[in-house]
Interface confidence: low
Amino acid sequence: DWVVAPISVPENGKGPFPQRLNQLKSNKDRDTKIFYSITGPGADSPPEGVFAVEKETGWLLLNKPLDREEIAKYELFGHAVSENGASVEDPMNISIIVTDQNDHKPKFTQDTFRGSVLEGVLPGTSVMQVTATDEDDAIYTYNGVVAYSIHSQEPKDPHDLMFTIHRSTGTISVISSGLDREKVPEYTLTIQATDMDGDGSTTTAVAVVEILDANDNAPMFDPQKYEAHVPENAVGHEVQRLTVTDLDAPNSPAWRATYLIMGGDDGDHFTITTHPESNQGILTTRKGLDFEAKNQHTLYVEVTNEAPFVLKLPTSTATIVVHVEDVNEAPVF
């Protein structure tokens, strides 16, 4: 029969060239001399001359190595004519399938990937996804099937396996508890992609994981006890600046302090505001104090943050003893 089964040719063949692939044969050659030819892309149209045919024997020839990543399949037509040029067969479809070799390494889509995750998250939390591509075939072979792995983690605190990467998808997740921005605010992971589903060529990239702040540190008074002196009758007088420390990210709602007078201000004589830069609590008089009525006030001030705590934290309290100083007032008649 004037039929050729699909021909498979591995890419990157070593030759020697021309290399015989298959023989075209018409059974009409019993009656007359047959001349064979081929047409189509790869024969008489671009890329021309990749394939040829021995005119009299019908041997299909490959003239040079093939590249599957350039052209994965060639569709040619075989022709058979008699000596006088008359066609003796209908044009025959010749399919040449280029089979894959593992001739490409995986490539990450970026040299450096960047992601972030909130401190204190539970294991299993997804951080980011990295991607590598491989030009080789991943459908019929494992040549282009990429497996991801984490090669190293910097720093290695609190231990060296804080993250894992999904072998197939490249999704990086938290695998251990203990992410603490105040101790380690960022990790650098060296990630690898290996073709042949993990048994082939490897390429490397970097994933930088930023640990985002959560309000897991309470502001703490330092010191916790203050003594101040205020002249009586003074309104808007700065009594004392209260200092707090907070380990959370500076100038964030988790760091910014909110002060509340919890006790000792029965007459509503005092107010406290937060200094926007230093985060100190500025205690001032809202009304004038009266030495003759009360010469000492003991205030209890509690500090929290603008943002709510993400876990149960003890709140810090400061004690301020305010001594009211006598001012020589004019007699009242």
Epitope: D111, T112, R114, H151, E154, P155
Partner: antibody, heavy 123, light 113 residues
Framework: EVQLLESGGGLVQPGGSLRLSCAAS????????INWVRQAPGKGLEWVGV???????NYASSVKGRFTISRDNSKNTVYLQMNSLRAEDTAVYYC?????????????????WGQGTLVTVSS | DIVMTQSPDSLAVSLGERATINCKSS????????????FAWYQQKPGQPPKLLIY???TRESGVPDRFSGSGSGTDFTLTISSLQAEDVAVYYC?????????FGQGTKLEIK
Amino acid sequence: EVQLLESGGGLVQPGGSLRLSCAASGFSFSSYPINWVRQAPGKGLEWVGVIWTGGGTNYASSVKGRFTISRDNSKNTVYLQMNSLRAEDTAVYYCAKSRGVYDFDGRGAMDYWGQGTLVTVSS
Amino acid sequence: DIVMTQSPDSLAVSLGERATINCKSSQSLLYSSNQKNYFAWYQQKPGQPPKLLIYWASTRESGVPDRFSGSGSGTDFTLTISSLQAEDVAVYYCQQYYSYPYTFGQGTKLEIK
């Protein structure tokens, strides 16, 4: 005062090997990544590679597979092992301290540099 | 790799005048999560190692005179010397540290006119 001092440069034949050292002082050495940067005669700067605090490394594609960076935190020293040297590796080699420990410190910028050591690859 | 291209290759400016050097990267150096540009400027005088001038594209390194300023974002960056001094004669390099491998520009030679 932060100081970095390179040594080990010299003349080597193509295909040969050389090991450069970078001795550091004046800062918490083990906490900082250290870079190697080279400069061919009359040319610009080329980043060679970096070693992170725990020993992880990254390299320029032109030296990958031929050069290896290592560190000995007990000696405050970083090493650059150069194998299969080529004429185009001829350069002054600088070691440079990363500006910060973390990315957000501007870790990729290099704030202190050694004076450099000359490596000449020639037959 | 990210390619850094400086312009001009050389520049002559009179003492006291403004000098401007440009650097263009082949991809954006702005990281959206922290809105920082992973970009630095260096100065190298003859026979000396480079000196860090600017990081994060616009933050002056400690001890660098305030006549040096950096600006720009994404792919286009500028180093400006507001009033050129004799000691500013040097080659200036830009560098990206967004992505490994880190890469430098080819350098701009600054001379006095």
